[in-house]
Amino acid sequence: LFGKLHPGSPEVTMNISQMITYWGYPNEEYEVVTEDGYILEVNRIPYGKKNSGNTGQRPVVFLQHGLLASATNWISNLPNNSLAFILADAGYDVWLGNSRGNTWARRNLYYSPDSVEFWAFSFDEMAKYDLPATIDFIVKKTGQKQLHYVGHSQGTTIGFIAFSTNPSLAKRIKTFYALAPVATVKYTKSLINKLRFVPQSLFKFIFGDKIFYPHNFFDQFLATEVCSREMLNLLCSNALFIICGFDSKNFNTSRLDVYLSHNPAGTSVQNMFHWTQAVKSGKFQAYDWGSPVQNRMHYDQSQPPYYNVTAMNVPIAVWNGGKDLLADPQDVGLLLPKLPNLIYHKEIPFYNHLDFIWAMDAPQEVYNDIVSMISEDKK
C-alpha cells in the first residue's frame, strides 16, 4: 500500500520548536531538571494564531505523550488535526511534556546516555520524578494553581501513578483527560505479549540494558500478524507501530513520513521489561527488581507495591478504542469502576491505540469534546 515513501513534509527533520513555529504558532522552549538529574525539554504554545490579543489568564493544558513516543505526537498532523494546535486556537495555554529517554529528554546532570545508569528507569520514575518536576515548573511559570492534564497511552499510566501516590500533585490537576488509558495490560493483544515469558537475564541479553531497539525479535511475528494484514511494509520495522498496532484507514498517509521520522522516540529496555512484567502479572504495580532482596532495597518489601487507582480523586474523562491492541477494552473495563471521580467515558468502537493522536477524524471523535469540557470547566 505504501511501499515507497516520498518525504514531502519539511517537519521530518525538524525539532519540536521548529515544528510549532513552522505552522505559525508561538513557541517557548524550556528545560526542566528532575530531582534525579534528568533534563526534559518542555514546549509551550502560549496562544493560537488568531487570539494573541486576548488578555487575561488562559487555562493551562498539559499534554503528555505515550510509550515510545514524544511531544511531537501532538503536533504531527496539520494544525486543524493536531490537538496541541487545536487547543491553542481555542484559547488555551498549551504545554507539551517529554518523558526521560526519548529524543528530547536524553540528558542527565550526572550520567551520560552512553551509560547503563542513565537507562535504569521505567514508567515508575517518569511518574515519581518527571511529572512532578514538569507540572511544578508549569505551575510556577504560569502562576496558575491548576492545569488540565491530557495523557495518551503511557502518559495516562504515569498520571494514574503520580496522581494516586502524590496528593499535593493531584491537587494541581483540574481534570485528567485520558486517551487510550493503560493501567493493567492483562488482556493486551500487543506484541509486548510475546515478551512476557522472556526472563530478565535473556531480555537484557537480547535487547541490551540501555535504549530499547526492537532488534530482530519481532520479525518472526510481523509477516503473519501485522504486515500481511495491513500491507504497510514501511511501518513493519517501526517499534511504535509494531507494539501499538496501526490502521491505515484512519491515517492521513501524506503525514506518514512525519510519524516515521519522529517515532519511535526511544525508551529504556528496563521500561519495556516493566511492561512485559505487567502483561505477565496482570497487575498494575511497580517494577519488580527480580528478587525479594532487591525489592526490599527499593521498596522495603519483598514484592513490588501495587498502584491503587482508587486513591486518585482527580476528575477524569476517558476515551478508549474498541480495536486498541495495547489498551484492550477488557483492561479498560477493569479500570473504569476503580476510578472514584469518573466524569465521562466514551468508547470509539473502530479506534486503535494510535488513532487518538493521529486519526483524521480525531477532532470529531475526541478533541472537540476535550475543548468543550475545558471550556465548561472555565465557567
Partner: nanobody, 115 residues
Framework: QVQLQESGGGLVQAGGSLRLSCAAS????????MSWYRQAPGKQREPVAA???????TYADSVKGRFTISRDNIKNTMYLQMNSLKPEDTGVYYC?????????WGQGTQVTVSS
C-alpha cells in the same frame, strides 16, 4: 508444555570443540526464542547464545566468533557448536525455550575444558 533435554557435554582439552544438542518434546517451531545458558562454578546462570524465530542470533561477547547457535525444526533440536574452547568455558550448559505459554529449561549438561 515443552520438555527440553541436553546432550553432548563432556571433558575436552583447551582449543578443542564440542557440539551440544537440545532435543525438544513437541515442536520447537512454536518457541519465539531458543537459548543456551552457562552456569560457571560458583556463578549465576547467564545466557551465552540466543536464536530468535526469525533466525537472528545474539551471542555473549566472551563466545563471539567461537560459538554458533542453530536449530533444526524438522528434528525439533537446537544446537550449540563450540569451537576453540577455553578453560573459562567450563560449566553446566542449559538449553531454554520461550514461547506463548512459558519459558522452559533443560536439565543441563556438564562441559569441562582442561588446560
Amino acid at each position: 508444555q515443552v520438555q527440553l533435554q541436553e546432550s553432548g557435554g563432556g571433558l575436552v582439552q583447551a582449543g578443542g570443540s564440542l557440539r551440544l544438542s537440545c532435543a525438544a518434546s513437541g515442536s520447537i517451531g512454536s518457541l519465539y526464542v531458543m537459548s543456551w545458558y552457562r552456569q560457571a562454578p560458583g556463578k549465576q546462570r547467564e545466557p551465552v547464545a540466543a536464536l530468535m524465530g526469525s533466525g537472528s542470533t545474539t551471542y555473549a561477547d566472551s563466545v563471539k566468533g567461537r560459538f554458533t547457535i542453530s536449530r533444526d525444526n524438522i528434528k525439533n533440536t537446537m544446537y550449540l557448536q563450540m569451537n576453540s574452547l577455553k578453560p573459562e568455558d567450563t560449566g553446566v550448559y542449559y538449553c531454554a525455550g520461550t514461547g506463548a505459554e512459558g519459558h522452559y529449561w533443560g536439565q543441563g549438561t556438564q562441559v569441562t575444558v582442561s588446560s
